[in-house]
């Protein structure tokens, strides 16, 4: 009976032990598995991501570009109405320049004297800019960049005096350090009467004869609006 | 987002000088004016001047001109006020402030400067 | 310099009411002012900016308006926060300037 006993211990033991190791195998193939699984959800987590980051960016794209379009259609249909009218009320900007609270811009890429440059503008039905307000400072020092730029800023007849007439005294300035000077050094002949735009933006006169670059200004007639689109 | 860190409290001497300093972070430090603005005990706000951290191109108030310099390291995306000739009446908080659209949208915490013998 | 002055000085009032200050320039600053709140042993926050532009995460029930040389800032309906003191600032030319302030208390 003993004996009986022993070998039915053994064979327990042996099942016992195939059944362990079969589990351990299991457990190892599901161990496996999950790992494949886990890295084949992240992959699928990461091409999802990638999917969805290149979506929010072509989105955005295409309302950058839907913007655009309605803003070239505005303009478009506005520069129709304008040369379907008789030109006297401008209600949106000329093709390539650029419209900040109700003027229009135009930033030269050469070199005028300040007469040139101020004959230029008027030719166009504009004025060298006249700054009236920080804001408009800092517009326009945005688009000419670090680069000596007339404004319709002068001092030709005696006193410093803007070219549309807004009031110089009481206005906005933004002079350099000890500007204006009428400075004489120069060896050109005569003072400086003439106003720029300097590298950082902020004021100084010099010889009107300098082949700087310059912006014109136009302003948008207050009384008429905005045609509606097509 | 967007933040304006100042120096802590500093006490001088009439005819010292002072160095306030404001750390940004969270924009461009190079795109945007600075001002500074100061607050002396249960007055007003008074503007200094401004700086330009691009160009370093400042603009000061006349009443300041000649006692106040207005520095920056972009490197670290610190500006930096220096006020000489400190009089009792220069006790004050003073406050860095970015430029905004026709205001100041964020300010420092302030640094409170105290003048006394 | 251009002079800002703000009335009236000081203005008590209840939660729930509606409360109006003015500013007014010493002369035409187009629409380029803004509006501070200011509350004691802290920095001024913007409120307003260009007379009637509400800057982000302030509360709908602050509003501004005008332009030229007198504008208004209007608080639709007093909130226990919103009691402090209000800075308008013309950022037209320099040197910018600020108005004295308006202290707004409980009645």
């Known amino acids: 009976q003993n004996a009986q006993l022993q070998r039915e211990l053994r064979g327990l033991r042996e099942t016992l032990s195939n059944f362990t190791a079969s589990t351990e195998a299991q457990v190892k193939g599901l161990s496996t598995q999950g790992g494949n699984v886990g890295r084949k959800m992240k992959s699928l987590e990461s091409q999802l991501e990638k999917q969805q980051k290149d979506l929010s960016e072509d989105h955005s794209s295409l309302l950058l570009h839907v913007k655009q379009f309605v803003s070239d259609l505005r303009s478009l249909s506005c520069q129709m109405a304008a040369l379907q009218g008789n030109g006297s009320e401008r209600a949106c900007c000329p093709v390539n320049w650029v419209e900040h609270e109700r003027s229009c811009y135009w930033f030269s890429r050469s070199g005028k004297a300040w007469a040139d440059a101020d004959n230029y503008c008027r030719l166009e039905d504009a004025h060298l800019v006249v700054v009236t307000s920080w804001e408009e400072q800092k517009f326009v020092q945005h688009h000419i960049g670090p680069v000596n730029t007339w404004m319709g800023l002068h001092d030709q007849n005696g006193p410093w005096k803007w070219v549309d007439g807004t009031d110089y005294e009481t206005g906005f300035k933004n002079w350099r350090p000890e500007q204006p000077d009428d400075w004489y050094g120069h060896g050109l002949g005569g003072g400086e009467d003439c106003a720029h735009f300097t590298d950082d933006g902020r004021w100084n006169d010099d010889v009107c004869q300098r082949p700087y670059r310059w912006v014109c200004e136009t302003e948008l007639d207050k009384a008429s609006q905005e045609p509606p689109l097509l | 987002q967007v933040q304006l860190v100042q120096s802590g409290a500093e006490v001088k001497k009439p005819g010292a000088s002072v160095k306030v300093s404001c750390k940004a972070s969270g924009y461009t430090f190079t795109d945007y004016y600075l001002h500074w603005v100061r607050q002396a005990p249960g007055q007003g706000l008074e503007w200094m001047g401004w700086?330009?951290?691009?160009?370093?191109?400042?603009n000061y108030a006349q009443k300041f001109q000649g006692r106040v310099t207005m520095t920056r390291d972009t490197s670290i995306s610190t500006a930096y006020m220096g006020l000489s000739s400190l009089r009792s009446d220069d006790t004050a908080v003073y406050y860095c402030?970015?430029?905004?659209?026709?205001?100041?949208?964020?300010w420092g915490q302030g640094t409170l400067v105290t003048v006394s013998s | 310099d251009i002079q800002m002055t703000q009335s009236p000085s000081s203005v008590s009032a209840s939660v729930g009411d509606r409360v109006t200050i003015t500013c007014r320039a010493s002369?035409?600053?187009?629409?380029?002012l803004a509006w501070y709140q200011q509350k004691p042993g802290k920095a001024p926050k913007l409120l307003i900016y260009?007379?009637?532009s509400l800057q982000s995460g302030v509360p709908s029930r602050f509003s501004g308006s005008g332009s030229g040389t007198d504008f208004t800032l209007t608080i639709s309906s007093l909130q226990p926060e919103d009691f402090a003191i209000y800075y308008c600032q013309q950022a037209n030319s320099f040197p910018f300037t600020f108005g004295p302030g308006t202290k707004v208390d409980i009645k």
């Open positions: 260009g007379a009637s």
């Open positions: 002369q035409g600053i187009s629409r380029w």
């Open positions: 402030a970015r430029d905004g659209t026709s205001s100041f949208d964020y």
């Open positions: 700086i330009h951290p691009n160009s370093g191109g400042t």
